[in-house]
Structures are given as structure tokens and as C-alpha cells.
């Protein structure tokens, strides 16, 4: 806490500029008007203030806006954002995607801090859902963002947002998350033709039920083994040998290399030996 002292003669700040880096903490407190600071926040980042000086500037903004900063100030916080606590951020009402991007940029390349997590949480709650533009932005900064959300949180993702999801965004998702995302993807891509649909839906198939796999088997999709191995075991088990053969197309030969691994192993054990023999792969049920 900085003591209230009168500003020395001639030191009253007329604008936020480089001369302020030579001010002691008490001088910044006494000589910089909070309203001036708020209107010229965009200049703060260009000036090499010390951490202690930034503390004073934050204190001035806190006094001016005890109920939380307005978005016009938040958007230009820059490195001052790193001084904010999650409690500070919970007072904010951030509605602009540009503001979100500006603050994420400050933290770019670093793990998600509690401040950023709170900011994102406030932003998404304010919007009511994780819309496409927001998801696009968040996964650009945090490729694992989607897979760090709970199935309950993912259920608020509208199908239209699924268009923003790239295959790599799903790399770390678990089966429960894919169970939630798959039906949304199916809805989002439903008007695409067969081969284009398969390219888009492929990353989500870890959440697909048996009947959808059966439908895909009728579309000459040639699923690769890596995708097949990520399918739900309970969804694969009811498939017939003919359906798996159609689903995998030329990749069906890869079953031999995976015969000891789930879901292939469990599927093999469910099939009649006569049917397995039609594949000519030497699979033993």
C-alpha cells in the first residue's frame, strides 16, 4: 500500500510516457491521475516499468474501478494483466473476442495460468456457449483446451462450433469426452457427402455407436487401422466380418498385426471361425 503524499511541483503527469519510469513509487501514486491512466492504458506496454511500478498503476486502477475494470481498459492491459488475480478478473465483464485475444497474447506460449483460466471461464459463461469463433481462438492458443474440459462443459458446445475443431485438438481427449463430441460432429457434418463427411468425422469416431459404424461400412470409407483401434470396443463387437471388411477396405490386412490388441482381439473372439477365414488373414477366434 502506497502512502498518500502530495505530488512535487512540476511532476504532475500530463500523459503516460517514458519519463514516468524515473518516478519513485510514491511519485507515481501522487502524480499520475487514475483517469488519465485509464484512457492511455495502451501506452503502458511500450514503457519498461518495473514490477513495483506496475503494482502502483494497478492500485490506481483498482481505486478508480472498485467494482471491476471496464472493457475499454481491460483490452489494453497488456502485461499489467499478469498482475491481476483471479479475484480481480471475476469482477470483469469481457464480451469482446478482441479483448480475449489481446489478453491471451500476453500469456502466449505459457501454460494456462489461473488468471487465464478465470478469464476464459468468465468469457464463455458470458456468451452462454462455446461458439465457433471463441473455440477457434482458444484452440489456437491452447491446442489441448477442448480435451481439458469436462463432458458436462463440452455439452454446452453447439454443433456449429465443431467446424472449428482440428484433428490435433482431439489428440488428448478421453472416451467420455468423445462420447459427447461425436453426436455434435455428426450433426454438424450431416450435409456433407460420403468421402468429405468421413474426413471430417474421422477424429471423432471414438465416440461412435455400432449403428453409425455399420452405416459407414456401406460407404467405401477405407478406415485406417489407427482410427479403427480407437473405436469403442462395445461399438465394434457387434460388427460382422463383412462389415469390418467393408469398413477397412484395403486396410483390412492390418487386422493381423493387431489381433492381440483391443478392440480387434475381443472382436475376433466374437466371430465364427468360418467367417474369419473368408478374410484369408489366418485370424483365430
Amino acid at each position: 500500500e502506497v502512502e498518500k503524499t502530495a505530488c512535487p511541483s512540476g511532476k504532475k503527469a500530463r500523459e503516460i510516457d517514458e519519463s514516468l519510469i524515473f518516478y519513485k513509487k510514491w511519485e507515481l501514486e501522487a502524480c499520475v491521475d487514475a483517469a488519465l491512466l485509464a484512457t492511455q492504458m495502451d501506452r503502458v506496454n511500450a514503457i519498461p516499468f518495473t514490477y513495483e511500478q506496475l503494482d502502483v498503476l494497478k492500485h490506481k486502477l483498482d481505486e478508480l474501478y472498485p467494482q471491476g475494470y471496464p472493457e475499454s481498459v481491460i483490452q489494453h492491459l497488456g502485461y499489467l494483466f499478469l498482475k491481476m488475480s483471479p479475484e480481480d478478473i471475476r469482477k470483469w465483464n469481457v464480451t469482446s473476442l478482441e479483448t480475449l485475444k489481446a489478453l491471451l497474447e500476453v500469456n502466449k506460449g505459457h501454460e494456462m495460468s489461473p488468471q487465464v483460466a478465470t478469464l476464459i471461464d468468465r468469457f464463455v459463461k458470458g456468451r452462454g456457449q462455446l461458439d465457433k469463433d471463441t473455440l477457434d481462438t482458444l484452440t489456437a492458443f491452447y491446442p489441448g483446451y477442448l480435451c481439458s474440459l469436462s463432458p458436462e462443459e463440452l455439452s454446452s458446445v453447439p454443433p456449429s462450433s465443431i467446424w472449428a475443431v482440428r484433428p490435433q485438438d482431439l489428440d488428448t481427449c478421453d472416451p467420455r469426452q468423445l462420447d459427447v463430441l461425436y453426436p455434435k460432429a455428426r450433426l454438424a457434418f450431416q450435409n456433407m457427402n460420403g468421402s468429405e463427411y468421413f474426413v471430417k468425422i474421422q477424429s471423432f469416431l471414438g465416440g461412435a455407436p455400432t449403428e453409425d459404424l455399420k452405416a459407414l461400412s456401406q460407404q467405401n470409407v477405407s478406415m485406417d487401422l489407427a482410427t479403427f483401434m480407437k473405436l469403442r470396443t462395445d461399438a465394434v463387437l457387434p460388427l460382422t466380418v463383412a462389415e469390418v471388411q467393408k469398413l477397412l477396405g484395403p486396410h483390412v490386412e492390418g487386422l493381423k498385426a493387431e489381433e492381440r490388441h483391443r478392440p480387434v482381439r475381443d472382436w475376433i473372439l466374437r466371430q465364427r471361425q468360418d467367417d474369419l477365414d473368408t478374410l484369408g488373414l489366418g485370424l483365430q477366434g
Epitope: 494456462m112 489461473p114 483460466a117 483446451y145 480435451c147 481439458s148 469436462s150 458436462e152 462443459e153 485438438d169
Partner: nanobody
């Protein structure tokens, strides 16, 4: 440097209980999605349970109602309470931490053996 260390495994009779721990350093269990996977001999690693950043949880169908995942932010540790254990739960159990950046870290595993 990220380090995950599992402990609490061991041998138990069917119907018994064990509590696995995953102590994390270099990552915060609150800011990461924390998951347990298991791998039985000759099998792929399979998902067991997860605790997401929000604190909500999920489970594989095979363990739901028997296993409970929890975390202690002060200890920076995630737990897996396993009860009603079955022989088919025999496996090496691995702790996984996934960051919003998409980085994934694994522990070295702890062995659980359930005899009938």
C-alpha cells in the same frame, strides 16, 4: 521439469480395496486434466477415470460405481479409490496429466493384482 509418481498399488483379494496416489511436481493438478489409465499384459492402455480442470469427473463403464477419483490441491496429488476390486482389474495403473497447451505427461505406473 514435470514429474508424476504413482503409488499405492499392491496385491489384494477380489472384493478388496486399494487407494492409488499420483503425486505431481512441475504441474498443478488443478490446472491440468488428470486421468488414470491401466494396461493389462497384452492389452492396450485403457481409460479408467478423469478429473477435469473444473473438478468434475468421469469414469469408464467398467469401473463406474466402484472407483472414485479425487484430488488434493494442497498436496498436488490425484487419488483413485478402488473398491469392489475384480480379477479383471489386474493391470499396471498409470497417471496422466494433460495441459491446455496439449502437452501430455505420464507416470511410471503402479501394479495392481487382484486374485480370486
Amino acid at each position: 521439469q514435470v514429474h508424476l509418481v504413482e503409488s499405492g498399488g499392491g496385491s489384494v483379494q477380489a472384493g478388496g480395496s486399494l487407494r492409488l496416489s499420483c503425486a505431481a511436481s512441475g504441474v498443478s493438478v488443478v490446472n491440468f486434466a488428470m486421468r488414470w489409465y491401466r494396461q493389462a499384459p497384452g492389452n492396450e492402455r485403457e481409460f479408467v477415470s478423469a478429473m477435469y480442470r473444473s473438478g468434475s469427473t468421469s469414469y469408464a463403464d467398467s469401473v463406474r460405481g466402484r472407483f472414485t477419483i479425487s484430488r488434493d490441491s494442497a498436496l498436488n496429488t490425484v487419488f483413485l479409490q478402488m473398491s469392489g476390486l475384480k480379477p479383471e482389474d489386474t493391470a499396471t495403473y498409470y497417471c496422466q496429466a494433460t495441459s491446455p497447451m496439449g502437452d501430455t505427461y505420464w507416470g511410471q505406473g503402479t501394479q495392481v493384482t487382484v486374485s480370486s
